[in-house]
């Protein structure tokens, strides 16, 4: 059956060394757990993380997200899953793609993540 | 298994404030956006704002512009509502409700509602 | 704002009835649309999302369908616990908004 893939229509924002969500949904919902789920950098398709068969790839990953990430599957099956990042880091600024893949149909969408330096803060003062 | 818990009943009078609290539990409070909807006695539903408690920013229904402001603590994974300048007319359940992670998504969790009755 | 009327207001009907509630949009709101049980005291409950999508934990025989302006909420066969008031809601623009209410009471 077809779906649409949807996400969040704003950045995600998250500060460095904190952790950072990104939801992705598809509609109508529908059971996902026998799909393939994933996200990749949208510049060069790094895979950030996959799952597939019902297991986390985590071979498949990019060097740079091993280890740092999550899949919370706990809503799989309504077609509801987050990518937790944890540790972000500056390089993970930019944009994001989930994909869900049913046999060989396949849905994506496009989200943000924004990443901020807790301790940076400019005295406009000082800006001449 | 998430859960909002809010404060209790409130009476009050015309022309002062009230300030209701949903405390969140069960969910990475910060990523989901927090809506208040109001129900007067007999009415139907009617959604008064929303916020995303990660940018902290607060949308609001015109018709509450300038009287209702939301917030939320992330500290305390606690949003509140205060509407001020109260009326007989804003004698009503109030609820606050969770959409999943963003805005324009339905209201999945609810919290048990506060009884707001404005009376001189 | 997209203003939801449902029809009926009241609706009266008999445990095991086939029971049929429509929500209709001022404008097209794609698929776009929950409903939501509520009894008396508690707070509102959601059956179905995206038009069509039951939520996890509610019975098979609640059911949606529609799209852009005309929606349906459809109790194939009524049971006891589904006498309550039954609200749709558009969420296809930043001010969600409310259908009336349908009250769906024993015959």
């Known amino acids: 059956g077809q779906f649409r893939v949807i996400g969040p229509g704003y950045p995600i924002r998250a500060l460095v060394g904190d952790e950072a969500e990104l939801p992705c949904r598809i509609s109508p919902g529908k059971n996902a757990t026998g799909m393939e789920v994933g996200w990749y950098r949208s510049p060069f398709s790094r895979v950030v993380h996959l799952y597939r068969n019902g297991k986390d790839q985590d071979a498949e990953q990019a060097p740079e997200y091993r280890g740092r990430t999550e899949l919370l599957k706990e809503t799989i099956s309504e077609g509801k899953v987050t990518l937790r990042i944890q540790n972000v880091r500056f390089s993970d600024e930019g944009g994001y793609t989930c994909f869900f893949r049913d046999h060989s149909y396949q849905e994506e969408a496009a989200m943000e993540l924004k990443v901020e330096d807790p301790f940076y803060w400019v005295n406009p003062g000082v800006l001449t | 298994q998430v859960q909002l818990v809010q404060s209790g009943a409130e009476v009050k009078k015309p022309g002062s404030s009230v300030k209701v609290s949903c405390k969140a539990s069960?969910?990475?409070?910060?990523?989901?956006?927090i809506s208040w909807v109001r129900q007067a006695p007999g009415q139907g539903l009617e959604w008064m704002g929303g916020i995303i408690p990660i940018f902290g920013t607060a949308n609001y229904a015109q018709k509450f512009q300038g009287r209702v402001t939301i917030t939320a603590d992330k500290s305390t994974s606690t949003a509140y509502m205060e509407l001020s300048s109260l009326r007989s007319e804003d004698t009503a359940v109030y609820y606050c409700?969770?959409?999943?992670?963003?805005?324009?998504?339905?209201?999945?969790?609810w919290g048990q509602g506060t009884t707001v009755t404005v009376s001189s | 704002d997209i203003q939801m009327t449902q029809s009926p207001s009241t609706l009266s009907a008999s445990v095991g009835d086939r029971v049929t509630i429509t929500c209709r949009a001022s404008q097209s709101i794609s698929s776009w649309l929950a409903w939501y049980q509520q009894k008396p005291g508690k707070a509102p409950k959601l059956l179905i999302y995206?038009?069509?999508s039951l939520e996890s934990g509610v019975p098979s025989r609640f059911s949606g369908s529609g799209s852009g302006t005309e929606f349906t909420l459809t109790i194939s066969s009524l049971q006891p616990d589904d006498f309550a008031t039954y609200y749709c809601q558009q969420y296809h623009e930043y001010s969600p908004t409310f259908g009336q209410g349908t009250k769906v009471e024993i015959k």
């Open positions: 409700a969770r959409e999943w992670y963003w805005p324009d998504n339905p209201f999945d969790y």
């Open positions: 069960g969910g990475t409070f910060s990523s989901y956006a």
């Open positions: 995206d038009a069509s």
